[in-house]
Each structure stands twice: as structure tokens, then as C-alpha cells.
């Protein structure tokens, strides 16, 4: 049978001779050279050679365990004379023995990590890892220990795990943001003679909101003309905040001051400046200077830093309103005046008043915009604004006169303003009532007495306050001996009635009735209108058949039948 133990071979042999591995030996070998030893398998004949007579094995080259830790070979022992095996072919192993020839290597040449500023001591930053190619099962060649070469006292590393932690309290990004830490990994458990490798860890402190906004000055002053429309930016203020990003965002607000309602402040979303803007229309003459208290605050606060104090700051903003030459201002937006239509020329109707709102109080002159009073019915006293008539009025022609008055600063004619004047002409009873239409009617020859042959209506151009009240009567010259009577209905209508039975058209074909219509106003106005009545032959239904004047085409009389 074969006689051998497991073969071991030290790696990285540097001797000048071949390295002895061991001996293959059969108990059948009598030492007379009758047996021949043959080697086959991993590296046989190349890496490993055998003395076929003695069975001694040698390694011809320097071996690296990290490249190949184990070689599997086969051994044969044959009888030289017969060529037959004296032992069964058997497999054996050559194990390469480790030496500490590899230094630890980090998984990254450079690590990048972040940690929030002001973190507690011992806050995890990053874990670094180094690997050692040597045999971890034998000795300490692959036992890695981590240490910090650069980066103290800010950071520390756990020797066993490679976990880097913060080591210093109150590390402030605003003071220093970047740190370069060098970590060493050493094998042999960190002992003398161990091999080592290093890596760089670039650590950035990330921002936390540990700084409040601060105004660089306590007072700001801006000017704006009183004519600035709402929304106009007046000026910019900026609180500085040592933090960055979201933590440096600032909200501005007006917290106090007389200008609380008049001004607004908004945050420029890009520059984080506060922009003071006009909120309501300003008036230099009412208030020339406003003082505001503006506050800058962080919208995103971190509760654990609130003990540092409020995350806000205040500044005073003084706003000076500048005078702008303004046009005169009328005492009313519009004026409504009234005048009787019987007013004489040069009658004063009323007056308008305009004043220069500026501090200078420039005198004002008045005029009528002639485009609105082409007929020059009205005039104005340029000095005191009194409106008076320059022509006679007639309510029945025009009830309302809409004119425009202009007020102009005497010292600065460019500054002018306009106001509408609505002048109502009041009614005077200066028109007599008259028939609503031309009345021409007929009466049948066989008409009976007291028959209604026509209803009369009147109209009046006037417009009395209590409404029209007309009275109707026959003119005095026709009242006695008339063939017809007038019946006043007391409702602004009257009826013409027959006064006798029967009319003869051959005796009198046409009657002309003068009717007096009066109003009931002061002074009383009256007029006389004539009603023409024709006598006609009628059928038994009272329908007209023929009249003396056949020109009567459109009779308005009522049927007088039966």
C-alpha cells in the first residue's frame, strides 16, 4: 500500500533550488529500482516533477496560494519489468500553505458620505470595508483591523467593523463643510509586521436649520410717488441666513406700524429678498411717511434648535410718500341741479366746487365743455363755479341737460378734471290743454235728445306734480241755444250729447261746436277746439247712409240708432 501523509507547501518560495514537496512511497518498494513512480494531474511534469526511482516530488516554480490553494494529483507505482501496477492509482493533495503576502484592500478607493451638522457624538456616517486575500482560516494574515490616520478629532472608526462615526460635538457646517478622512486597514490583527491599505472618505456636513435669519441693518428707507398703483414694488430688503437650501428660506411679513393696511411684503422666490409693495392707493396730502415693522422668519424650523432663540428677526422700514401734482378734485362725483323752465337768462342754478388736492392748493378755474352744451344754454363763473342760464329753457323740449364742467389748475393747465352735471328742468304750467285728436262726428236725423254722439279727450304738454285735471265746456258764445251739450266726465274726458229730438240736414247740414278745455294748474291755461258735427241720414240701426258732405269718410260718432 501507499505510504504518505498530506503534502504541504509554503507559498511564495524564493530559494534558488527546487522546493521539496515530499515523497511517494509504496511498501512494495525494496529499493532495488524495480519500481517506477509516475505523477499525473494538476501541474504534473510542469509545476511538480517526480524522481521516478525515489518518488521524491519537487516544485519547480514559485506558487501563490491566493491564485490556487490546492493541487490534486494522481500517483502510480508500476513494475518496470512487467509494466504492471504494484499499487492502485491513487489521488493525493498538495495544499499550499499561506503566508501574509497580501495587504487589505478597500472596496472603494474613495468613499463619499454625508452627515448632518450638529449631530450627536457617535452618529453613524458610513461603513468602509477592506478585504484581505490571505487565508482567513490560518493565522491572522487576513484579520483586518481599522484605524483612523487622518480626520481626528472629528471622526472615529470602529476597529472591527469599519463604521465611521462622528466624534466631536457641535460640528458646524457654517464653520467647515468638507472633511477628508483617511482610514487604514491593517492585517495580522493590527500587530507589528502586518500589511496595511488605506482609503479616503470625503465627508460633507449637510445643513440643518441652526441659524436664524438676520437683517444686516435695523432700518431701511424707501420712497414712492403717491401715484403708485397697488402692487407696485417700492424696495427690497434682505435678511441673511447662514444656512442653505430650504433652511435658508425666508418669509417676510409686516407685523406692525401705521402702514399695515397700505403696504404688503412678499418674498422673492429666487433671491429670498423681501419686496415691499403698495397695497392701497396712497395720498401724500393725507400721510407723507409710513413706518412699518417687517419680520423675516424661517418657515422650516427644527424644534431641537429652538432653544437657540426665535428663528426670526425684525427691521423697521420707513416709507416716504412723494408728492405728485394731481388734478383738481370735485366735491362730488356728479352734480344734480334743477331749475324752473320759466327761469330768466342769467339765473343761477347752483354751483360746483373743485380743489387742488396738492399741498400747493393751486387756484382753480371752471369752464363748460362746449361739446356737451353746443347750444350754449348754460354758463359757469370761472372763478366761483356758479352755473347760470344763458338762454331760455323749455322743459317740453328737453327735460334733462347733461353737461360736463372742467376744473383746471390756473398755474398748471395740464392738470384738469371733469365732472358730469345733470340739470333737470322743472315744469311750469305754460302749455294749454288741447284735443287729443281732430274730432269730426255725425248725428242721425232721427236722433233722440241726450244721446252721446262723441267722447272727447285732451292732452297737455305740461307735467303737473299732481297730474292733469281738465275741464270741458262749450264756449260762451255757443252755450245758449246750442243744439248740443257738453257733459264733463270729471276724468279728463267729456261727452257731446244731443239736445233735441231730430235734426234736418236740409236745414243745417253741419254744426261747429267750440269747446273750451282748461287745466287746473297755476296759472290756468285754456284753449278752444272745434268739433264738427254733420247731420246724416241713417238706417234703422243708426248706421250712417248719406250726409250732405260725403267727404265724411271716417266718422268717429257713436251709433244713434233707436
Amino acid at each position: 500500500s501507499w505510504m504518505w501523509n498530506q503534502f504541504f507547501l509554503l507559498e511564495e518560495y524564493t530559494g534558488s533550488d527546487y522546493q521539496y514537496v515530499g515523497k511517494l512511497h509504496s511498501d512494495q518498494d525494496r529499493g532495488d529500482g524495480s519500481l517506477k513512480y509516475i505523477l499525473s494531474g494538476d501541474g504534473a511534469g510542469d509545476l511538480f516533477i517526480i524522481n521516478e526511482n525515489t518518488g521524491d516530488i519537487q516544485a519547480t516554480k514559485r506558487l501563490d496560494r491566493e491564485e490556487k490553494p490546492v493541487y490534486i494529483l494522481r500517483a502510480q507505482a508500476i513494475n518496470r519489468r512487467t509494466g504492471r501496477p504494484v499499487e492502485p492509482e491513487s489521488e493525493f493533495i498538495i495544499k499550499i500553505h499561506d503566508i501574509n503576502d497580501n495587504e487589505p484592500i478597500f472596496t472603494k478607493e474613495v468613499y463619499t458620505a454625508t452627515v448632518p451638522e450638529m449631530s450627536d457624538v457617535g452618529t453613524f456616517v458610513v461603513q468602509v470595508t477592506a478585504t484581505d486575500a490571505d487565508d482567513p482560516t490560518y493565522g491572522n494574515s487576513a484579520k483586518v483591523v481599522y484605524s483612523i490616520l487622518q480626520g481626528q478629532p472629528y471622526f472615529s472608526v470602529e476597529s472591527e467593523t469599519g463604521i465611521i462615526k462622528t466624534a466631536l460635538l457641535n460640528m458646524d457646517r457654517e464653520n467647515r463643510e468638507q472633511y477628508q478622512v483617511v482610514i487604514q486597514a491593517k492585517d495580522m490583527g493590527g500587530q507589528m509586521g502586518g500589511l496595511s491599505g488605506t482609503t479616503t472618505v470625503n465627508i460633507t456636513l449637510t445643513d440643518v436649520n441652526d441659524n436664524p435669519p438676520r437683517f444686516p441693518q435695523s432700518t431701511y428707507q424707501f420712497k414712492t410717488p403717491e401715484s403708485s398703483p397697488p402692487g407696485t414694488p417700492i424696495g427690497r430688503i434682505k435678511a441673511s441666513d447662514a444656512d442653505v437650501g430650504e433652511n435658508a428660506e425666508i418669509e417676510y411679513s409686516i407685523t406692525d406700524g401705521e402702514g399695515l393696511d397700505m403696504f404688503d411684503v412678499i418674498t422673492d422666490q429666487e433671491t429670498q429678498e423681501g419686496i415691499i409693495t403698495v397695497k392701497k392707493l396712497l395720498d401724500f396730502e393725507k400721510k407723507k411717511v409710513y413706518t412699518l415693522k417687517v419680520e423675516a422668519s424661517n418657515p422650516h424650523v427644527e424644534p431641537r434648535f429652538l432653544y437657540l432663540g426665535p428663528f426670526k428677526d425684525s427691521a423697521t422700514v420707513r416709507i416716504v410718500v412723494e408728492d405728485v401734482d394731481e388734478p383738481p378734485v370735485f366735491s362730488k362725483l356728479a352734480y344734480i341741479l334743477q331749475i324752473r323752465e320759466d327761469a330768466q337768462i342769467n339765473t343761477t342754478i347752483g354751483s360746483v366746487t373743485a380743489q387742488d388736492p396738492d399741498a400747493a392748493r393751486n387756484p382753480v378755474k371752471y369752464s363748460v365743455d362746449r361739446h356737451t352744451d353746443m347750444d350754449r344754454i348754460f354758463n359757469i363763473d370761472s372763478g366761483n363755479g356758479s352755473i347760470f342760464t344763458s338762454k331760455l329753457l323749455d322743459r317740453e323740449t328737453l327735460l334733462w341737460h347733461n353737461i360736463t364742467v372742467i376744473a383746471t389748475e390756473i398755474n398748471n393747465p395740464k392738470q384738469s378734471s371733469r365732472v358730469p352735471l345733470y340739470i333737470k328742468v322743472l315744469d311750469v304750467n305754460d302749455n294749454a290743454p288741447e284735443f287729443a285728436e281732430f274730432y269730426e262726428t255725425f248725428v242721425c236725423e232721427k236722433a233722440k235728445a241726450d244721446q252721446l254722439i262723441q267722447t272727447l279727450r285732451a292732452v297737455d304738454k305740461d307735467d303737473p306734480y299732481s297730474g292733469h285735471q281738465f275741464s270741458f265746456s262749450l264756449a260762451p258764445e255757443a252755450a245758449s241755444g246750442s243744439n248740443f251739450t257738453i257733459q264733463d266726465n270729471k276724468d279728463n274726458t267729456a261727452g257731446i250729447l244731443t239736445r233735441k229730438n231730430g235734426y234736418n240736414r236740409h236745414e243745417m247740414s253741419t254744426y261747429l261746436l267750440p269747446v273750451v278745455i282748461s287745466d287746473n294748474d297755476y296759472p290756468v291755461q285754456s284753449s278752444t277746439g272745434t268739433v264738427t258735427v254733420r247731420v246724416c241720414a241713417c238706417d234703422h240701426h243708426g248706421n250712417m247712409q248719406s250726409c250732405h258732405a260725403e267727404a265724411l269718410i271716417h266718422p268717429t260718432g257713436l251709433s244713434t240708432g233707436a
Partner: antibody
């Protein structure tokens, strides 16, 4: 006076690319975020992209419909705004406007005349 | 994403009429972040009202804006022929969004 002039529009095939430019003048370009807004023919307005100022690290924002296909950029030294459009689709056909916000970087106060992009096979 | 719902979509009005367009936000926003635009056919949009209430330069006084939280409105006191346009509301929180627009026509 604020002036924005777009260029670079034209006819392009689907999946093609186009780069729009906008030259700005009449204001301090570096203090304003800038935007691209588009309007398809006969349709409403659609915001496309925004780029912030240097202080804000030139942060960019995009509408979901163009994310990963369009890139907004700016050259402060030349007062130029750009829109690189890749992998174009027919639905990207529109008038593209370069737009500056109002003071304080609110709203969209100043618009260019627009440049027409037509995506068609 | 904040969705802005405008109403009405279209409306016809006569000169002299009072017009109100509303804009409803899907979640509450600061009035600083809501703006209105006017766009006439063939032209770029024009800022009309900024930060909910303030009239942009050159905008006639007949235009007013109001609102807070989720509810905003644009009013034209007395409509004029030149006001025929499409009106959009817009909010500033990224992603910026616009209302679908209100087309105002002459009756």
C-alpha cells in the same frame, strides 16, 4: 424694456430632436427663474419646464409629459435660455414660449412671440 | 399637482355687461400664487392680474381679481368689444398649472 425672442422651432420627425433657444434682454437675467410654456394648436396653455437661478443651483423642474425627454438649461453670461427636446412625439407639436416671471418671481409676466415646433412623419 | 377648474368654458356677452369668470383650485393656495392672463387670437398670452388682485401695467380698471384659498375670480365691470379673448388662470406651485381657459365672445 423686457424682450424675449425664441428660435429653433421647425418640422421634425417623431423620435427626432430639436433645440430651442431664447435670447433675453432688458432685465437682469441672473435674478429670474425662467420657463418654457407651450400651446398646442387650438388648445390651452401648458407649462413645460423651469430653471432656477445660480443661488438655487440652477434647479430644474419639468412637466410629467416631458420628463426624461426635455432638458432646460441657461447661459447667464449670454442671457440665453435653452430647451433640448429629444425623442419627440406628435403630441409635442405646439407653439413654444419663453417666459419670465414678474418681480419676485411670481406669475408669468413677459412672454416671447413663440417658436412653432411641428412633429410629423 | 394642483388642478385649476375654470368656468364657464365659453360665454357670450354684450358691451356694457358685467362678466365674472371663476377659477377653482383642487387644493388651497396662497393668493400670491394665483394669476390671470388674456390671450387674443394669434398673440402671445398677456399677464392681466397678478397675485390675485393686482392689475398688470396698462390693464384697464374695469378688470378686477379676487379670491382666496381654493376659490378665485376675474371680473370685467363693463365688457367692451376689445375684451373678446380667452382668459386663463394659473398657479405658481411646481408643477405650474393653468386653467383650461374661458373664451369670451360678443353676443
Amino acid at each position: 424694456e423686457v424682450h424675449l425672442v425664441e428660435s429653433g422651432g421647425g418640422l421634425v420627425q417623431p423620435k427626432g430632436s430639436l433645440k430651442l433657444s431664447c435670447v433675453a434682454s432688458g432685465f437682469t437675467f441672473t435674478t429670474y427663474a425662467m420657463n418654457w410654456v407651450r400651446q398646442a394648436p387650438g388648445k390651452g396653455l401648458e407649462w413645460v419646464a423651469r430653471i432656477r437661478i445660480k443661488n438655487n443651483n440652477y434647479a430644474t423642474y419639468y412637466a410629467d409629459s416631458v420628463t426624461d425627454r426635455f432638458t432646460i438649461s441657461r447661459d447667464d453670461s449670454q442671457s440665453m435660455l435653452y430647451l433640448q427636446m429629444n425623442n419627440l412625439k406628435t403630441e409635442d407639436t405646439a407653439m413654444y414660449y419663453c417666459v419670465r416671471p414678474d418681480y419676485g418671481n411670481y406669475g408669468l409676466a413677459y412672454w416671447g412671440q413663440g417658436t412653432l415646433v411641428t412633429v410629423s412623419a | 399637482e394642483i388642478v385649476l377648474t375654470q368656468s364657464p368654458t365659453t360665454m357670450a356677452a354684450s358691451p356694457g355687461e358685467k362678466i365674472t369668470i371663476t377659477c377653482s383650485a383642487s387644493s388651497s393656495i396662497s393668493s400670491h400664487y394665483l394669476h390671470w392672463y388674456q390671450q387674443k387670437p394669434g398673440f402671445s398670452p398677456k399677464l392681466l392680474i397678478y397675485r390675485s388682485f393686482y392689475l398688470a401695467s396698462g390693464v384697464p380698471l374695469r378688470f378686477t381679481g379676487s379670491g382666496s384659498g381654493t376659490s378665485y375670480s376675474l371680473t370685467i365691470g363693463t365688457m367692451e368689444a376689445e375684451d373678446v379673448a380667452t382668459y386663463y388662470c394659473q398657479q405658481d406651485i411646481v408643477p405650474l398649472t393653468f386653467g383650461a381657459g374661458t373664451k369670451l365672445e360678443l353676443k
